[in-house]
Interface confidence: low
């Protein structure tokens, strides 16, 4: 089933990684993956 | 009035299923993640199931996956939580739950600031 | 899996502070809100983002995250803020509750 994914995009937050994990919020801490055209990178 | 108003709990036996509804209303689902959170009786809060705006995208508790899914009828404003193959365990108030989303700024986390009044399920012989 | 820890009470009298803590792994490094849910009610948000208020919460209410524990501090408890407390966090894309804690105003 499709489960959620976290989308590419990230941005620095009070000198911490948010990452753009569309629908559920963003994550302050460590890289759970990053999407590009669809491929899970990291 | 942002509301959300939950039904279709009730007595099960185990192995049975349910159907729970929840109808929201002043806001669109379809716009919103939405979630399922349960609570035993005397218990905590435990997350169910998450449906986010993209309906293609969803995700379950290990304690539910494989046994329980989520929905929306977005024509009717209206998130389900299909839940089959019903445990002792499974008894407990479900909730359902908006994600705050500021939409200006839609990547970040604000908690779930809508609640409905809850339904009670009880899986029992 | 990702474990959130509150103590199960925490008693205070009327108008002195109480501080609810929420101890997980590098919990700083996440996102947390609190809900305060009172018997036979639906939970309510009263801290979201580590440390902001929803409108219409007291200004009582407030919160901190940093390393490994957050916390919940209530100024000038009243009677009405006798409720259970948790704390909700982020892991990766689910959500974690603590426990929960029981206030107690003595």
């Known amino acids: 089933d499709a489960e959620f994914r976290h989308d590419s995009g990230y941005e620095v937050h009070h000198q911490k990684l948010v990452f753009f994990a569309e629908d559920v919020g963003s994550n302050k801490g460590a890289i759970i993956g990053l999407m590009v055209g669809g491929v899970v990178i990291a | 009035e942002v509301q959300l108003l939950e039904s279709g709990g009730g007595l099960v036996q185990p192995g049975g299923s349910l159907r729970l509804s929840c109808a929201a209303s002043s806001f669109q689902i379809s716009k919103n993640t939405m979630w399922w959170v349960r609570q035993a009786p005397g218990k905590g809060l435990e997350w169910v199931s998450v449906i986010g705006k993209d309906e293609t995208r969803f995700n379950y508790a290990d304690s539910v996956k494989g046994r329980f899914t989520i929905s929306r009828d977005n024509s009717k404003n209206t998130l389900y939580l299909q839940m089959n193959s019903l445990r002792a365990e499974d008894t407990a108030v479900y909730y359902c739950?908006?994600?705050?989303?500021?939409?200006?700024?839609?990547?970040?986390?604000?908690?779930?600031?809508?609640w409905g009044q809850g339904t009670l399920v009880t899986v029992s012989s | 899996s990702y474990e959130l820890t509150q103590p199960p009470s925490v008693s205070v009298s009327p108008g002195q502070t109480a501080s609810i803590t929420c101890s997980g792994r590098n919990i700083g490094d996440s996102w947390v809100a609190w809900y305060q849910q009172k018997p036979g009610q639906s939970p309510v948000l009263v801290i979201y983002?580590?440390?902001k208020r929803p409108s219409g919460i007291p200004e009582r209410f407030s919160a901190s995250n940093s390393g490994h524990t957050a916390t919940l501090t209530i100024s000038g408890t009243q009677a009405m803020d006798e409720a259970d407390y948790y704390c909700s966090s982020q892991d990766t894309v689910t959500r974690v509750f603590g426990g929960g804690t029981k206030l107690t105003v003595l």
């Open positions: 983002r580590d440390d």
């Open positions: 739950a908006r994600e705050w989303m500021d939409h200006s700024r839609p990547y970040y986390y604000y908690g779930m600031d809508v």
